[in-house]
């Protein structure tokens, strides 16, 4: 006899993990055999879809490999034309082991700021997220909190927050661990010990101390009267994130010395400064008969020519002696680019030693002029042709600038080394190398070791000593 369909096994809720099998059963009793159709979220399932399996005339629906998107309400409907269609529904809950979808990353943060280490998770049931610092579970406190998203927020980051972190996502199906990440706490540069001011006598040595800390360890630079310190020796040591810098100075003039501690935070820098003055006892202005003072050469042009830490005479008739004298050599130096290779090093040596004369410190700082013999060696041996050309230009008034004339000495007016060997300065660049006559050895001391060669006789010569100039 015909019998309307009756569902004898109503659908139940099915839990399945992603990639697992999920089966719904809809056992039907009826005569004739019913047609059974299936829907998911009220949309008909196409039974030829290879992701599904149908058994026993549609009474078993199997999803062969569950995906996230299979979650929903499944209904079976049975109809055999006798009576009405019958339906039963059940849910598929796609369960998922915890998965960390946005893991934490290494973070560098400045002390006092807020740090957030991300840890976004997926899973069903929703995973709980906890954090591990080093080897121990992280305890939440007034500054640290695990957000709803799973991310770790640290307010007012402190040095002790630095370390290795990982997040742990847990649900009833399993546990997932993120990779270990590093939280690095950076600290602005800070001066722990500022340099002290000194009042010293002219020509004495002073050591200025500056100690700084920070993460990363800062670098220390010294500034003298607004410019980078070019003379003096700097010694540094680093211990336990503390840098100690000592600047040793030979004092020839008063100055303001600034210690600058700098460290880098990404693209930005943090800086801390401390300053000290060094004054000279009984130093007012240079006395009336005192035309200048001694100081270490801090320029650039004559760096290779003058001795390292050379004490040079700075002429106070200029408002800014260092700048004015440097400008003098700079101007003349550019013109030397066109002279012969034989002349150029000799002329450069003469130029620098003439403009920046060696200085004898004392109560009255005194410039030491170049020895006449060296000046003549440049004029008549190394640069004879160039010197003549220059004098011609001068006679014809082609040099309008006084500056140029100031940078060229008049050899005849210079003292001879035969009168008083200490009264004039020698040019070691002109010391003759017997193995290679064209070589100008690097300057080592202010005392030449070899004789200068014979100079050609010249009618314009303004000196009456023998043609061989003895240099020893």
């Amino acid at each position: 006899l015909p019998k309307a369909p009756v569902i004898t096994t109503p659908l139940e809720t099915v839990d399945a993990l992603v990639e697992e099998v999920a089966t719904f059963m809809c056992a039907v009793e009826s005569y004739p055999q019913p047609e059974i159709s299936w829907t998911r979220n009220k949309i008909l399932i196409k039974l030829f879809d290879t992701r599904y399996s149908i058994r026993e005339n549609g009474q078993l629906l199997t999803i062969l490999s569950v995906e996230d998107s299979d979650d929903g309400i499944y209904c079976c409907t049975a109809n055999n034309g006798v009576g009405g269609a019958v339906e039963s529904c059940g849910a598929l809950q796609v369960k998922m082991k915890p998965k960390i979808t946005r893991p934490p990353i290494n973070v560098k943060i400045i002390e006092g700021l807020k740090a957030v280490l991300p840890c976004t998770t997926m899973g069903n049931p929703k995973p709980s997220v906890s954090w591990i610092k080093g080897d121990s579970p992280l305890r939440e406190n007034s500054r640290t909190a695990v957000l709803e998203s799973g991310s770790l927020r640290i307010h007012n980051v402190q040095k002790e927050d630095a370390g290795q972190y990982r997040c742990v996502a847990k649900n009833s199906l399993g546990t997932a661990y993120s990779k270990v990440v590093k939280l690095e706490v950076e600290v602005f540069a800070r001066i722990l010990r500022a340099p002290e001011s000194h009042n010293v006598t002219f020509g004495s040595f002073v050591t200025l101390h500056c100690t700084a800390t920070g993460i990363p360890v800062p670098t220390i630079t010294w500034i003298e009267n607004g410019n980078a310190v070019s003379s003096g020796s700097i010694q540094e040591s680093v211990k336990d994130r503390v840098i100690d810098s000592r600047l040793q100075l030979f004092i020839t003039k008063p100055g303001l010395y600034t210690c600058i501690a700098t460290n880098k935070h990404g693209e930005k820098f943090s800086t801390a400064k401390a300053a000290a003055t060094v004054s000279i006892a009984e130093w007012s202005k240079p006395q009336k008969d005192n035309k200048g003072y001694c100081a270490q050469y801090r320029g650039e042009v004559c760096n290779a020519v003058l001795a390292k830490d050379a004490l040079v005479f700075l002429n106070t008739s200029y408002a800014d002696p260092e700048e004015a004298q440097e400008l003098l050599v700079h101007t003349a130096w550019n013109e030397l680019k066109v002279v012969s290779p034989l002349c150029r090093p000799a002329a450069e040596a003469l130029l620098c030693n003439h403009v920046f004369q060696e200085c004898s410190p004392g109560v009255v700082p005194t410039p030491i002029p170049i020895c006449r013999e060296y000046c003549l060696a440049v004029k008549e041996l190394f640069c004879a042709k160039e010197w003549l050309a220059m004098e011609e230009k001068t006679h014809r008034g082609l040099y309008r600038s006084e500056m140029h004339l100031l940078s060229v000495p008049e050899c005849s007016k210079l003292p001879s080394m035969h009168w008083d060997p200490t009264a004039c300065a020698r040019l070691p660049h002109l010391d003759y190398n017997k193995e290679n006559p064209k070589t100008f050895p690097p300057m080592t001391s202010s005392k030449p070791s070899v004789d200068i060669p014979n100079l050609p006789s010249s009618s314009s010569s303004s000196f009456s000593v023998s043609p061989t100039y003895s240099m020893t």
């Epitope: 096994t9 139940e12 099915v14 839990d15 399945a16 993990l17 697992e20 099998v21 089966t23 059963m25 056992a27 055999q33 399996s53 149908i54 058994r55 026993e56 005339n57 009474q59 078993l60 199997t62 062969l64």
Partner: antibody, heavy 121, light 107 residues
Amino acid sequence: EVQLVESGGGLVKPGGSLRLSCAASGFTFSASTMAWVRQAPGKGLEWVSSVSGDSHHIYYADSLKGRFTISRDNAKNSLYLQMNSLRAEDTAVYYCARERLLRLGVGFDSWGQGTLVTVSS
Amino acid sequence: DIQMTQSPSSLSASVGDRVTITCRASQRISGFVNWYQQKPGKAPKLLIYAASTLQSGVPSRFSGSGSGTDFTLTISSLQPEDFATYYCQQSYSPLYTFGQGTKLEIK
């Protein structure tokens, strides 16, 4: 009374072919899903393949796909298993079984006596 | 495929003993589990279906339980005719799989 009788077993060389048959009686064959299950000597049971009453739904064990073919002839109440490219590891007793929808899932409620297939050179 | 892991693989017991055989599925399979008994040289026989329902004609000393992934077949008081090999089988997936079997021997 449900009856299932297998035939077609025997000795075959590796690489050879064999066709097994199962004659069914005592139930509505065309409405029943049928299956083949095998058992290697001294080993456990292994499901081979199933076919629905209307032959629309056919399943194979992954390890056998491509070499074995299940089919049925409802007019003759017969189930078949065509076995090609036979290997030594296919040596087993092959059972024909009826699948039945149970309270939960399906089970093999009726079995044949089995037919022995020996693959050896 | 869903794997069915049966234990123990063999078991010695005496008549009158209570015996338990377990079967674990590699994923949750609700109650889609059947138990079979097979005697040497014979075809398997369905004992229990849907994890706990006794097939008609099977003595009541046989019982089944479990859901999800863990299932149990229990023989409350062994009889001489019960010495055989027992198999579990899942039908949750259309690619059916059996456990490797438990051989129940007389002690």
